[in-house]
Interface confidence: medium
């Protein structure tokens, strides 16, 4: 057993060396080790094949060190590894895309607080067993296409506290089992209408504290299991383009955050969900650092990520709401409620923890994938109940005289709910 470490065999063969001031991975780690705890040291480099002899290793904690470099082959031979915690290594900044290749049994990967600026192509390739991926509190600016494509068993993806400015079409492709997606505290101004296409099992979506002024209803349509959505702390523009989002929220019966309006000024601070339909009139004209939203440009969107308010044909001018004009029976807002049956109610009153699935199931060390969280996953906190079906939001065809509220690349539909503890 290395000098700074404590080694023991029960309940698992363990080499434990936390907070010992180690500057390198110690030599002489017993080959039979199933758990290695090296957190809280001063290790700056993980050389290739550092743990190659430890074929039975299932848990490796390297968090809270000063890692600046991890060789691409650092974890070679660790075919049984289930938990890898590299979090809180702010100098790391980048990880070679081959670093995690071969870790076919990995179910929990912590890369939070690592100063990561980008996710290299293929970084998570082959991690078919991964269920929990922690990427929060980094410096990520973009979500490259197909980054998570192989993660078909991923249930929790933490991306909050980064610098992500948009959610492109293929960002979350392949995440068919995802239950929880945390994107709050980023700089998201635009969500592609098809960004959430594969997320049919998503129950929790956090988008609060971003730069969203609108959200395409089409993006929310695939979220059939959605229960919790937080949209607060965004610069929502509550004009005619917010109608689909408003309508969706009226139907949604889960638990949702407030959606406070930023514009127009007369509605600033008010919750979109609590507005009346005729409050959402015309097109707000932004002032100050924002660009005017009502323009004749040919693009589908304004710089804020809002759909453009369309200029009608001359004959249809009377059917378009201009700022300040009251809604009338013949205006372009008529019929804007997305079709679809109302979702079933979830009952009134608070849900009680001890009656919930996670509140009663034991946290077994080797549970079935579908039942209980595996060892190394995040705690249930206040657990969620079983999935409730949500209606898909389809869109009606719209004539040229209508604002293209629900079309691809435009509009502002939203959904949902959130519960946070």
């Amino acid at each position: 057993c290395p000098g700074a470490c404590v080694c023991y065999n029960e309940p698992k063969v363990t080499t434990s060396c936390p907070q010992q001031g180690l500057q390198a991975v110690p030599v002489g780690i017993p080959a039979a080790s199933q758990r290695i705890f090296l957190h809280g040291n001063r290790i700056s480099h993980v050389p290739a094949a550092s743990f190659r002899a430890c074929r039975n290793l299932t848990i490796l904690w390297l968090h809270s060190n000063v890692l600046a470099r991890i060789d691409a082959a650092a974890f070679t031979g660790l075919a049984l590894l289930e938990q890898l915690d590299l979090s809180d290594n702010a100098q790391l900044r980048s990880v070679d895309p081959a670093t995690f290749h071969g870790l076919g049994r990995l179910h929990t990967l912590h890369l939070d607080r690592c100063g990561l600026q980008e996710l290299g192509p293929g970084l998570f390739r082959g991690l078919a067993a991964l269920q929990y991926l922690y990427l929060q509190d980094n410096a990520l600016q973009a979500l490259p296409d197909d980054t998570f494509r192989d993660l078909g068993n991923l249930t929790h993806l933490f991306l909050h506290g980064n610098r992500i400015s948009s959610v492109p079409e293929r960002a979350f492709r392949g995440l068919h089992s995802l239950d929880r997606l945390l994107l709050h505290q980023n700089r998201v101004a635009h969500v592609h209408p098809h960004a959430f296409r594969d997320l049919g099992r998503l129950m929790t979506l956090y988008l609060f504290a971003n730069n969203l002024s609108a959200l395409p209803t089409e993006a929310l349509a695939p979220l059939r299991a959605l229960q919790y959505l937080r949209l607060n702390d965004n610069p929502w523009v509550c004009d005619c383009r917010a109608r689909p989002l408003w309508a969706w929220l009226q139907k949604f019966r889960g638990s949702s955050s407030e959606v406070p309006c930023s514009l127009p000024q007369r509605l600033a601070g008010r919750d979109l969900k609590r507005l009346a339909a005729n409050d959402l009139q015309g097109c707000a004209v932004a002032t100050g650092p924002y660009h005017p939203i009502w323009t004749g440009r040919a693009t589908d969107e304004e710089p804020l990520g809002l759909p453009k308010c369309c200029q009608p044909d001359a004959a249809d001018k009377a059917s378009v709401l201009e700022p300040g004009r009251p809604a009338s029976a013949g205006n372009a807002l008529k019929g804007r409620v997305p079709p679809g049956d109302s979702p079933p109610g979830n009952g009134s009153g608070p849900r009680h923890i001890n009656d919930s699935p996670f509140g009663t199931l034991p946290g077994s060390a080797e549970p079935p994938l579908t039942a209980v969280r595996p060892e190394g996953s995040e705690p249930p906190g206040f657990p969620t109940s079983g999935p409730r079906r949500r209606p898909g939001c389809s869109r009606k065809n719209r004539t040229r005289s209508h604002c293209r509220l629900g079309q691809a690349g435009s509009g502002g539909g939203g959904t949902g709910d959130s519960e946070g503890s």
């Epitope: 936390p18 705890f37 957190h39 809280g40 904690w61 968090h63 979090s87 939070d112 922690y134 929060q136 509190d137 933490f158 909050h160 506290g161 945390l182 709050h184 638990s255 955050s257 608070p350 849900r351 009680h352 923890i353 001890n354 919930s356 996670f358 509140g359 009663t360 199931l361 034991p362 946290g363 077994s364 060390a365 969280r373 595996p374 060892e375 190394g376 996953s377 995040e378 705690p379 249930p380 906190g381 206040f382 657990p383 959130s418 519960e419 946070g420 503890s421």
Partner: antibody, heavy 124, light 107 residues
Framework: QMQLVQSGGGLEQPGRSLRLSCVTS????????MHWVRQAPGKGLEWVSG????????GYADSVKGRFTVSRDNSKNSLYLQMNSLRAEDTAVYYC?????????????????WGQGTLVTVSS | DIQMTQSPSSVSASVGDRVTITCRAS??????LSWYQQKPGKAPKLLIY???NLQSGVPLRFSGSGSGTDFTLTINSLQPEDSATYYC?????????FGQGTKVEIK
């Protein structure tokens, strides 16, 4: 700085009621679950109850279920514990605590801030 | 409910000694265990969260490890101000439960 200020404790007879309050400041109360933990004289800590940020989930220890009710008012940054049908064994110092958990951090942090505690004595 | 069993119930050690407190859960709780320090008449103070993560401001002589059912809190070089009662708490399943406490005294 962060503060959790408790009130409402005191002496009460068995079978009667008391309401504890915990007023917070220095953080965004809306974003956190909150808990009540108690400690009987000379004994250890016992988790009593917890409530999620939006009151959508609520939990109780078996020993208080059906008698105690936890609630919160986010507009007042306040947490409450309504204690009915008090028993002698409810005598304890009651603490409110903030739960800095994964719903906002993505990573569990335990009960990172606590109130000063308020003594509840149940005696005839 | 998940039972948490701490051992020893009390320990007396000298300044500079290494003190180890163990906590065993009655069923697997993954990493979801916190450690608290409480001094007489004061509210508990969070030391370690998620089994091994040191809470901000806590001295480096405190460390935690373990996963599943067996957990350890280690005080590497005991200081006079470490005289207190230490509690583990599982946060894996509701209701959350605490261990019965370990009283650490300075010889």
């Amino acid at each position: 700085q962060m503060q959790l200020v408790q009130s409402g404790g005191g002496l009460e007879q068995p079978g009667r009621s008391l309401r504890l309050s915990c007023v917070t400041s220095g953080f965004n109360f809306n974003d956190y679950a909150m808990h009540w933990v108690r400690q009987a004289p000379g004994k250890g800590l016992e988790w009593v109850s917890g409530i999620s940020w939006n009151s959508g989930a609520i939990g109780y220890a078996d020993s208080v279920k059906g008698r105690f009710t936890v609630s919160r008012d986010n507009s007042k940054n306040s947490l409450y514990l309504q204690m009915n049908s008090l028993r002698a064994e409810d005598t304890a110092v009651y603490y409110c605590a903030r739960d800095y958990n994964y719903e906002t951090s993505g990573y569990y942090h335990g009960f990172d801030n606590w109130g000063q505690g308020t003594l509840v004595t149940v005696s005839s | 409910d998940i039972q948490m069993t701490q051992s020893p119930s009390s320990v007396s050690a000298s300044v500079g000694d290494r003190v180890t407190i163990t906590c065993r859960a009655s069923q697997g709780i993954s990493r979801w265990l916190s450690w608290y320090q409480q001094k007489p008449g004061k509210a508990p103070k969070l030391l370690i969260y998620a089994a091994s993560n040191l809470q901000s401001g806590v001295p480096l002589r405190f460390s935690g490890s373990g996963s599943g059912t067996d957990f350890t809190l280690t005080i590497n070089s005991l200081q006079p101000e470490d005289s207190a009662t230490y509690y583990c708490q599982q946060t894996n399943n509701f209701p959350y439960t605490f261990g019965q406490g370990t009283k650490v005294e300075i010889k």
